[in-house]
Structure formats: C-alpha cells, structure tokens
Interface confidence: medium
C-alpha cells in the first residue's frame, strides 16, 4: 500500500497548530471499517493517534492531536497537532493498514522567531578612540539555535573576538547572547544580526559610538 507524505519537513511555529499530511489511495469500495491507521513517533515508536474498527481511537499524545474524520474515506490520513512545542520536533510515522499495509515518515521542524536584539555597551561612557569596548547583543525566545553575525558601519564582517552563548529555557526556546570585543575607531557603528536558520528570519540592531 503506497502511503504518501511531504518530502520536506513541516515547519510549525511554537504555539501554533501544524498539519502532518499523509495520504493513501483507497481501493474502490473501501470502507472505513477496514482501516487501521496509526500515527507514532518514528524513533521511540510511541503511539500518537490511531483509528481502528471504524472509530477514532483518540489521542495518546497529550490530547493535542486530531484526525480529519470527514476526509479519511478519501484517503486523507493527515494528523493535526495542536499548540506545537519544541519537544514535538522530530519524525512522525503514518502507518496505514487496509489489507496490505504501508507507512511513511514526515518530519516536523519547530521554529520560533527571535526577538529584536538589545545592545549594551561596557563601559558605556567616557569612551575615546583606542579604547576597548565590549558590546553585548541579546535576543530571546527563539528556536532553533540562532546564527549571529557582527559587522561594522561599512558592512565589513567582524569575526574576531566574538563570543556567543545560547541557553535553552524550560520550553526549549533559546536566549542568545553574543559579545563583541572591539577597539574603538574615530566613530563607529556596530551591528548585530540574529538569524533564525529555519525561518530565514533576521533580527538586527545596531549601536553607534561617537
């Protein structure tokens, strides 16, 4: 039995609902009473949701999943996952058994946009050209881990003396702190760009030191 899922990962924002698409081609005369549908986590084989003996057997996954019962008879075995969390990220297997059986796995990629970075300066006064300054760029509550880029006012990348740390909170979202140590020129603008690699979302801020 051919079971079809999207090749590309399904990207879902934290807190939103995601649909994991799965379809099969029912034979003529197919009856839902014949269908055994199982959604499970691919790696651990943990049951997520099932349909058997003509009935939705319900969610086994924190009561956050649902099928599309009106579409099952047409071969739509998709799963709706509500209030997506970071912990949901991974591969889900859609297993369909009628007489023959088949399965396919679909990947869920969870994402959360990073906040606009805040910039702090240390020291933050009485600065003169030639002084060494520490600029901290902080952005919060994103997923997955960010890519951080620094550049000067002319757009030249600044790669030396950069230290970036990322810490996950209880929800699995990352707070990113990137520190640039730089020797001040006559006047300078320094920009920090925090990129979410999944969402291709850039959040940036800059500071000008005169």
């Amino acid at each position: 039995l051919e079971v079809q899922v999207p090749e590309d990962p399904v990207v879902a924002l934290v807190g939103t609902d995601a649909t994991l698409c799965c379809s099969f081609s029912p034979e003529p005369g197919f009856s839902l009473a014949q269908l055994n549908l199982i959604w499970q986590l691919t790696d651990t084989k943990q049951l997520v949701h099932s349909f058997a003996e003509g009935q939705d057997q319900g969610s086994a996954y924190a009561n956050r999943t649902a099928l599309f019962p009106d579409l099952l008879a047409q071969g739509n075995a998709s799963l709706r996952l509500q209030r997506v969390r970071v912990a949901d990220e991974g591969s889900f297997t859609c297993f369909v058994s009628i007489r023959d059986f088949g399965s396919a796995a679909v990947s869920l990629q969870v994402a959360a946009p990073y906040s606009k970075p805040s910039m702090t300066l240390e020291p933050n006064k009485d600065l003169r050209p030639g002084d060494t300054v520490t600029i901290t760029c902080s952005s919060y509550q994103g997923y997955p881990e960010a890519e951080v880029f620094w550049q000067d006012g002319q757009g030249v990348p600044l790669t030396g003396n950069v230290t970036t740390s990322q810490m996950a909170n209880e929800q699995g979202l990352f707070d990113v702190h990137s520190i640039l140590r730089v020797v001040l020129g006559a006047n300078g603008t320094y920009s920090c760009l925090v990129r979410n690699p999944v969402l291709q979302q850039d959040a940036h801020s800059s500071v000008t030191i005169t």
């Epitope: 003529p28 197919f30 014949q34 691919t42 007489r99 399965s103």
Partner: antibody, heavy 119, light 113 residues
Framework: EVQLEQSGPDLVKPGASVKLSCKAS????????INWVRQRPEQGLEWIGW????????KYDETFKDKATLTTDKSSSTAYMQLSRLTSEDSAVYFC????????????WGQGTLVSVSA | DIVLTQSPSSLTVSVGEKVTMSCKSS????????????LAWYQQKPGQSPKLLIY???TRESGVPDRFTGSGSGTDFTLTISSVKAEDLAVYFC?????????FGGGTKLEIK
C-alpha cells in the same frame, strides 16, 4: 454481535461440485472481507482466500485458484464458496472468518461446514 | 510462501503448570517501521472453531485471560500459558498475515494429565 452462520454438512461424490454458504449478521456485510479456511482431518489450517462484498474483489491462495470460487449476495448478507472437481483430498471442514479490520487476523469465525467426498 | 513451524507438535501437562510453545517463521514477520510482527495465535478446542488469542505477536485479544501471553519478534515467537487450566485443552495455531498467501503453523496439541 458479529455472527457467521455456515451451511450444514455435505456428502458429495468425487468429480462433483458443492456450494457452501456463510450468512453474516451483526455488522455491515459490505464493510469487511470474508475469508475461507480449510481444515482437513487431524491437520492444520489452510487459508483459501477472501472476498470483499463491497465490490466483489477476491484474493486466492494459488493452491485453491482452480478449486474454489468465492461469491457473495449482498441482499442476504451471505458469502458463498463453490468447490469444484472434488476429490477425497477435499474432504475437510471449511470455515468462513471475518477479520477485525482490513487484512488482519481473524477475530470472528463461522462454526464450520464438513464436506465429505466419497463414492 | 512463508512457512510457520510449530513445536512441539503435542505436549501433556498437569493443571497449574506453565506451558510454552514455539512458532518459527521461515522469514521475518517484523514490520520495522512500527516494530510489530504480523503473527497471531489461535486456540481451537475439540469440535469448535478457532478462537483468536493473540495478535501482533503479543497483544492479547479482548476477553482472553491474562494467563495467555505472546512474545517474540521477527522469526521466533512463543505462546506461554502461565498456569494451565483443564479448559485449555486445545490445539494452538500460529498464523502470519505479513505476506500473501497467509499461512498457519501445523499446530501444537495441548493435553492435560
């Protein structure tokens, strides 16, 4: 309650044909396959094939393709198996069985029909 | 065709004893994706139709006493009766529905002393 009621025993002559019946009740007949299984005296079970009453599609074990013909009558919720060119080797109890769903294990069985082939 | 070989062909035990019987398949019945084996066990008492006991190698059918346990995966399967009762006198068959044609083992006849 799902029930499969099979026809009574049959004594037939070699070379003849026989038609066994299996009347289903307690569920929607057109929703599930009816399987047929043979059990010869003091022997194991042999799967013959299934028929899906919804559209009449069938699947046979190659061994029985020229021996058994499966049909259904939706109006009476009855499945039939005709056995042709009978020999003493065909003397057996024949069961009809319904799966739990799709092509799964057999959760419901008829009581069996004994077919005796003898001159 | 997939061949299922059951052993022993018969065994005699006393009431209360533990019984194990084996079913070996000529090829794996494991569907890796869901880590389940397509093997069922049936009980056939004298003069009766077979009755489903276990499916997916280890899932007990509703209403089947918990003294019946199925185990195994791939090619080697076992049916265990933890404490035999007189009413367990029967022939036990395994069956695969992994691949057509569906096939049964030759059976294990359980007799009571």
């Amino acid at each position: 309650e799902v029930q499969l009621e099979q026809s009574g025993p049959d004594l037939v002559k070699p070379g003849a044909s026989v038609k066994l019946s299996c009347k289903a009740s307690g569920y929607t007949f057109t929703d599930f396959d009816i399987n047929w299984v043979r059990q010869r005296p003091e022997q194991g079970l042999e799967w013959i094939g299934w028929i899906f009453p919804g559209d009449g599609s069938t699947k046979y074990d190659e061994t029985f393709k020229d021996k058994a013909t499966l049909t259904t009558d939706k109006s009476s919720s009855t499945a039939y198996m005709q056995l042709s060119r009978l020999t003493s080797e065909d003397s057996a109890v024949y069961f009809c069985a319904r799966p739990r769903y799709g092509g799964s294990w057999f959760a419901y069985w008829g009581q069996g029909t004994l077919v005796s082939v003898s001159a | 065709d997939i061949v299922l070989t059951q052993s022993p062909s018969s065994l005699t035990v006393s009431v209360g004893e533990k019984v194990t019987m084996s079913c070996k398949s000529s090829q794996s019945l494991l569907y890796n994706t869901i880590q389940r084996s397509y093997l069922a066990w049936y009980q056939q008492k004298p003069g009766q139709s077979p009755k489903l006991l276990i499916y997916w190698a280890s899932t007990r059918e509703s209403g089947v006493p918990d003294r019946f346990t199925g185990s195994g995966s791939g090619t080697d399967f076992t049916l265990t009766i933890s404490s035999v009762k007189a009413e367990d006198l029967a022939v036990y068959f395994c069956q695969q529905n992994y691949q057509y044609p569906w096939t049964f083992g030759g059976g294990t006849k359980l007799e009571i002393k």
